[in-house]
Interface confidence: medium
C-alpha cells in the first residue's frame, strides 16, 4: 500500500510514505562518502604522523571524531542505494543491522568526542593549574576508551532490533526496527518512543548542554582575564578554542533538525498532530537525516578553513607526495612538518606553562 489518502473532517492529505527524493539525497550521500573518507582519512594521517611527545590532550578526541565519522561514511553507499531504490533494501539483514548500528555509534561517539574537546578546553582555560593532571595523555586515553565503550553499548539496541522485511506487503524490503522480540503489539510504540527519546537525550541534549556549560565558563574566563593575560598565550589558546567552537556550532546546526523532527513525530502520538503536519514531518525527515549525515564530512574542511596550521600540514603532505613521485629524498624535518599536531599548537604555551607549574608545586 504505497499511498495513503488522509481523511480529516475538514481536510484531505495525500500520503506517500517516505516520498522519494529522486537522486538528490543519494547524490549527497555519495558526495559525503567521498569527501568524508578522504577528509577524515587525512585528519587521521596528520594526527598519527606526529611524534607522540608533540601530541596534545585534545588530539585523541580529534582522532576519535575522525574515526567515528570515517566508520560511518563508509556505510553511506548502502544508504544511498536504499534511498535511490525508494526505500528498498537489497543488502540483507546483517548489512542492515551493521550499517544502522554504525549510524548510532557515530551519533554517540561524535557527540561525546566534542564534549571531550569542550571539556578539555574548559580545563585548559578555566582551571589550568588545578586540573593539569586531568589533561595528561593517560587520562585522555581513558576518557576515549570510555566514550567508545559507551557509544558501542548505547547503540546496541539498534544492532539487536534492526531487521529487514516487507512491512506493507509490497515487493519492497525495508530496513527497520522490529520490537516484536521485546514488546507486544500494544507496547511497541512505547519502545519506539522510549528508545527515540533516550537516544536524542543521551546523543544530543546532554552532550550539547555540557558543551554550552563549558563555553559559558570559558567565555567568562576569557572576558575576565583579557587584560591580564600575555597576548601571545591568549592568541594561541583562543585559536584552538575558536576551531572547537566552530565544530560544536556546526554539529548543533547539522543535528538539531534531525532530533527536532524525530521528537515532534513521536509527540504526535500524544498530541494528535493534524494529518498535514504529520505528512510534513515525514516528508522533511529524509532531508533532516541527510543534513545530519553531512556533518560527518565537514570537520576536516572546518580545520582547513579555520586553522592555517592544518593547511600547512596538508600542504607539506602534498609537497612530500610530489617529491616522492619525483624520486626526491626527504629530511626528517620535512616529514615532521606534515603533522597535524606540530602545526596545530598542540603543545601550546598554556599546556607547557601549566604542566611546569604543576611540577613545581610538587
Amino acid at each position: 500500500f504505497d499511498n495513503y489518502y488522509g481523511a480529516d473532517n475538514q481536510s484531505e492529505c495525500e500520503y506517500t510514505d517516505w516520498k522519494s527524493s529522486g537522486a538528490l539525497i543519494p547524490a549527497i550521500y555519495m558526495l559525503v562518502f567521498l569527501l568524508g573518507t578522504t577528509g577524515n582519512g587525512l585528519v587521521l594521517w596528520t594526527v598519527f604522523r606526529s611524534s607522540r611527545e608533540k601530541r596534545r590532550s585534545a588530539d585523541i578526541f580529534i582522532a576519535s571524531l575522525a574515526v567515528a565519522d570515517l566508520t560511518f561514511v563508509v556505510t553511506l553507499p548502502l544508504w544511498a542505494t536504499y534511498t535511490y531504490r525508494d526505500y528498498d533494501w537489497p543488502f540483507g539483514t546483517f548489512a542492515c543491522k551493521l550499517s544502522s548500528y554504525l549510524i548510532f555509534v557515530n551519533m554517540y561517539a561524535s557527540a561525546f568526542c566534542l564534549t571531550g574537546l569542550s571539556f578539555d578546553r574548559y580545563l585548559a582555560i578555566v582551571r589550568p593549574v588545578a586540573n593539569a593532571r586531568l589533561r595528561l595523555r593517560v587520562s585522555g586515553a581513558v576518557a576515549t576508551a570510555v566514550l567508545w565503550v559507551l557509544a558501542a553499548l548505547l547503540a546496541m539496541p539498534v544492532m539487536v532490533l534492526r531487521t529487514t522485511g516487507d512491512l506493507e506487503n509490497t515487493t519492497k524490503v525495508q530496513c527497520y526496527m522490529d520490537y516484536s522480540m521485546v514488546a507486544t503489539v500494544s507496547s511497541e510504540w512505547a519502545w519506539e518512543v522510549g528508545l527515540g527519546v533516550s537516544s536524542t537525550t543521551v546523543g544530543f541534549v546532554v552532550p550539547f548542554t555540557i558543551m554550552l556549560t563549558c563555553y559559558f565558563f570559558i567565555a567568562q574566563t576569557i572576558a575576565g582575564h583579557f587584560r591580564k593575560e600575555r597576548i601571545e598565550g591568549l592568541r594561541k589558546r583562543r585559536r584552538l578554542l575558536s576551531i572547537i567552537v566552530v565544530l560544536v556550532v556546526t554539529f548543533a546546526l547539522c543535528k538539531m533538525p534531525y532530533h527536532l523532527v524525530k521528537t515532534l513525530y513521536m509527540l504526535g502520538s500524544l498530541l494528535h498532530w493534524p494529518c498535514d503536519f504529520d505528512l510534513f514531518l515525514m516528508n522533511i525527515f529524509p532531508y533532516c537525516t541527510c543534513i545530519s549525515y553531512v556533518n560527518s564530512c565537514l570537520n576536516p574542511f572546518l580545520y582547513a578553513f579555520f586553522d592555517p596550521r592544518f593547511r600547512q600540514a596538508c600542504t607539506s603532505m602534498l609537497l612530500m607526495g610530489q617529491s616522492r613521485c619525483a624520486g626526491t629524498s626527504h629530511s626528517s624535518s620535512g616529514e615532521k612538518s606534515a603533522s597535524y599536531s606540530s602545526g596545530h599548537d598542540y603543545k601550546d604555551d598554556d599546556d607547557k606553562h601549566h604542566h611546569h607549574h604543576h611540577h613545581h608545586h610538587h
Epitope: F1, Y4, Y5, G6, A7, D8, C13, Y15, D17, W18, Y87, G165, D166, L167, E168, N169, Q174, C175, Y176, M177, Y179, S180, V185, S186, E188, W189, A190, E192, G196, V261, K262, Y265, M266, G268, S269, L270, H272, W273, C275, D278, L279, L281, M282, F285, T289
Partner: nanobody, 129 residues
Framework: EVQLVESGGGLVQPGGSLRLSCAAS????????MGWYRQAPGKGREFVAA???????SYADSVKGRFTISRDNSKNTVYLQMNSLRAEDTAVYYC???????????????????????WGQGTQVTVSS
C-alpha cells in the same frame, strides 16, 4: 492485551449500505494503523481498507469509491462505511491493528505483522436479495 471488537454487520440488499465499527483497547490507538480485512466462504483473508495513525488511508481496488474508512482517536474506534454493496462483498469482516514504524524506519504501517494476533472476532456481512 489488545482487544478489537467489531460490530455493525448484518444482512443487506444489493446496493444497500452498512457501517462497521471496531472498538480497540489495550494499545496506543493513535500510533497504530487500523485495517479491515474480509474472508469470504472458502476463500483466504483479503485486504479491504487501512488507515494510518495520522488518518491516512488506503483501499483495495475492488472497494475504491464505495467504501470509506475513518477513525475517531478520542473513542479508539475505526469505522468502515460500505455503500453500493454487491453480492461479492459477502464475507466475515475482521478488524486488525498493527504498529506504525518510527519515522527513522519510514513510518510504514507494519502490515506484515497482521498474523501476530491483533485481530477481532469478525462480523458477518451478507449481501443478498
Amino acid at each position: 492485551e489488545v482487544q478489537l471488537v467489531e460490530s455493525g454487520g448484518g444482512l443487506v440488499q444489493p446496493g444497500g449500505s452498512l457501517r462497521l465499527s471496531c472498538a480497540a483497547s489495550g494499545l496506543t490507538f493513535s500510533s497504530h494503523c487500523m485495517g479491515w480485512y474480509r474472508q469470504a466462504p472458502g476463500k483466504g483473508r483479503e485486504f479491504v481498507a487501512a488507515i494510518s495513525g495520522s488518518r491516512g488511508y488506503s483501499y483495495a481496488d475492488s472497494v475504491k469509491g464505495r467504501f470509506t474508512i475513518s477513525r475517531d482517536n478520542s473513542k479508539n474506534t475505526v469505522y468502515l462505511q460500505m455503500n453500493s454493496l454487491r453480492a461479492e462483498d459477502t464475507a466475515v469482516y475482521y478488524c486488525a491493528a498493527v504498529p506504525r514504524a518510527g519515522i527513522e524506519s519510514g513510518a510504514y504501517c507494519k502490515w506484515s505483522y497482521k498474523d501476530s494476533g491483533s485481530w477481532g472476532q469478525g462480523t458477518q456481512v451478507t449481501v443478498s436479495s
